[in-house]
Interface confidence: medium
């Protein structure tokens, strides 16, 4: 692999990371917008920081940091930055794989935990504005009512519930959506993992090439 290959590798890594950095900026910006406007509120009071805004801010920030390391490391041919980029991607990949395994193993436990959290939040609907905002957003967006159905609202369904008497529950609808889109979710997850592995491979290859080039020109 000569100088031209090194250049190609360097710019491919740079442009892809630049693209991801811009995406990260957008996600972070959207997260900040959600935090400011607080449209979605808090659904799980046992996890108060688990809001849509916070999730977007964290994900956006991680993408921005990783992409920045990739951009600067490739364009400046900086081994330290490239290795940091490689290690961060490896940590993210391992975290994703661990999370996937845990979700698979503890699916039933997670379902129970989520259902309990949702039941608790339904009881807070009239007393907590943040919970009210969260439920209203979800019910309007998913066109659903309650956790499993309208009868979850013991004092009658709120205005955000669709007018259909036999509307489906939100937890039910979300699970159904997940199950019916399982293939697409799987494909997206695999694509993300492939992109991460490619990023790691490119970073490692570029790192090795920098070493070889340095030796060739006698540095």
């Amino acid at each position: 692999m000569g100088m031209s290959s090194l250049k190609l590798l360097k710019y491919v890594l740079f442009f892809f990371n630049l693209l991801f950095w811009i995406c990260g900026c957008c996600i972070l910006g959207f997260g900040i917008y959600l935090l400011i406007h607080n449209n979605f509120g808090v659904l799980f009071h046992n996890l108060p920081s688990l809001t849509l805004g916070n999730v977007f801010v964290i994900v956006g920030s991680i993408i921005m940091v990783v992409a920045f390391l990739g951009c600067m490391g490739s364009i400046k041919e900086n081994k330290c930055l490239l290795m940091s980029f490689f290690i961060l991607l490896l940590i993210i990949l391992l975290a994703e794989v661990t999370l996937a395994i845990l979700l698979f193993v503890y699916e039933q436990k997670l379902n129970e935990y989520v259902a309990k959290g949702l039941t608790d939040s339904i009881h807070r609907y009239h007393s907590d504005n943040s919970t009210k905002a969260a439920w209203d957003s979800i019910q309007s967006f998913l066109q659903c009512c309650g956790i499993n159905g309208t009868s979850d609202w013991t004092s009658g369904p709120p205005a955000s519930c669709p007018s259909d008497r036999k509307v489906e529950g939100c937890y039910a609808k979300a699970r159904l959506w997940f199950h019916s889109n399982f293939l697409y979710i799987g494909i997206i997850t695999i694509c993300v993992c492939v992109i991460e592995v490619l990023g790691m491979s490119f970073a490692l290859t570029l790192n090795c090439q920098i070493d070889k080039t340095s030796q060739t020109i006698g540095l």
């Epitope: 499993n148 159905g149 309208t150 009868s151 009658g156 007018s163 259909d164 008497r165 036999k166 489906e168 529950g169 937890y171 039910a172 609808k173 699970r175 159904l176």
Partner: antibody, heavy 118, light 112 residues
């Protein structure tokens, strides 16, 4: 034509659980909710709850929320109701009834007589 | 819960004579879609219930037109213009507007 088949009778011991079935035929099972209704000997009807054929959405009468669990098996076109912690108060006839979505219970099963006795 | 009160508790009618059953709900059964989800069911001795009427006055297929339903909001009536021997049994009203769905206590129709 629409048919809802239920076993005739179940004899169970106090404190035990029982799973009642309701096999549907003659219509598209996945298009209608299924209701369950209780009738104690010589008494009126009580609505237990209803379940959507997706198996996830359900609506319960608060009185039965910790007593009955409704489930669905789409592959066999069967609706189930599990009754737990049975007492003599649970001795009754349990009916399943199809919901024609726009209205209410248009077709009923023959009912399963549950007797709780030691 | 919505309470459905049926009157009379029992009714003894001669064949060919009319019969009337009243059902009152503790709150209006008019739903936001403009429909009133009030049903009438018939349960013959030893049989499972059978729907006669839905949305107050709509007759189910195969139900003779001697049965008719009327009323609105909280007051509803089931009328049988000429009672026949096969009409004996218990009649229930059922509301499907609010959860939990609730039945009336039932009216036993006997033939004199």
């Amino acid at each position: 034509q629409v048919q809802l088949q239920q076993p005739g009778a179940e004899l169970v011991k106090p404190g035990a659980s029982v799973k009642l079935s309701c096999k549907a035929s003659g219509y598209t099972f996945t298009s209608c909710w299924m209701h369950w209704v209780k009738q104690r000997p010589g008494q009126g009807l009580e609505w237990i709850g209803m379940i959507h054929p997706n198996g996830y959405s359900s609506n319960y009468n608060g009185k039965f929320k910790n007593k009955a669990t409704l489930t669905i098996d789409n592959s066999s076109g069967t609706a189930y109701m599990q009754l737990s912690g049975l007492t003599s108060e649970d001795s009754a006839v349990y009916y399943c009834a199809r919901d024609d979505y726009a209205e209410t219970m248009d077709y009923w099963g023959q009912g399963t007589s549950v007797t709780v006795s030691s | 819960d919505v309470v459905m009160t049926q009157t009379p508790l029992s009714l003894s009618v001669t064949i060919g004579q009319p019969a009337s059953i009243s059902c009152k709900s503790s709150q209006s059964l008019l739903y936001s879609d403009g429909k009133t989800y009030l049903n009438w069911l018939q349960q013959r001795p030893g049989q499972s219930p059978k729907r006669l009427m839905y949305q107050v006055s709509k007759l189910d297929p195969g139900i003779p037109d001697r049965f008719s339903g009327s009323g609105s909001e909280t007051d509803f009536t089931l009328r049988i213009s000429r009672v026949e021997a096969e009409d004996l049994g218990v009649y229930y009203c059922l509301q499907g507007t609010y959860y939990p769905w609730t039945f009336g206590g039932g009216t036993k129709l006997e033939i004199k």
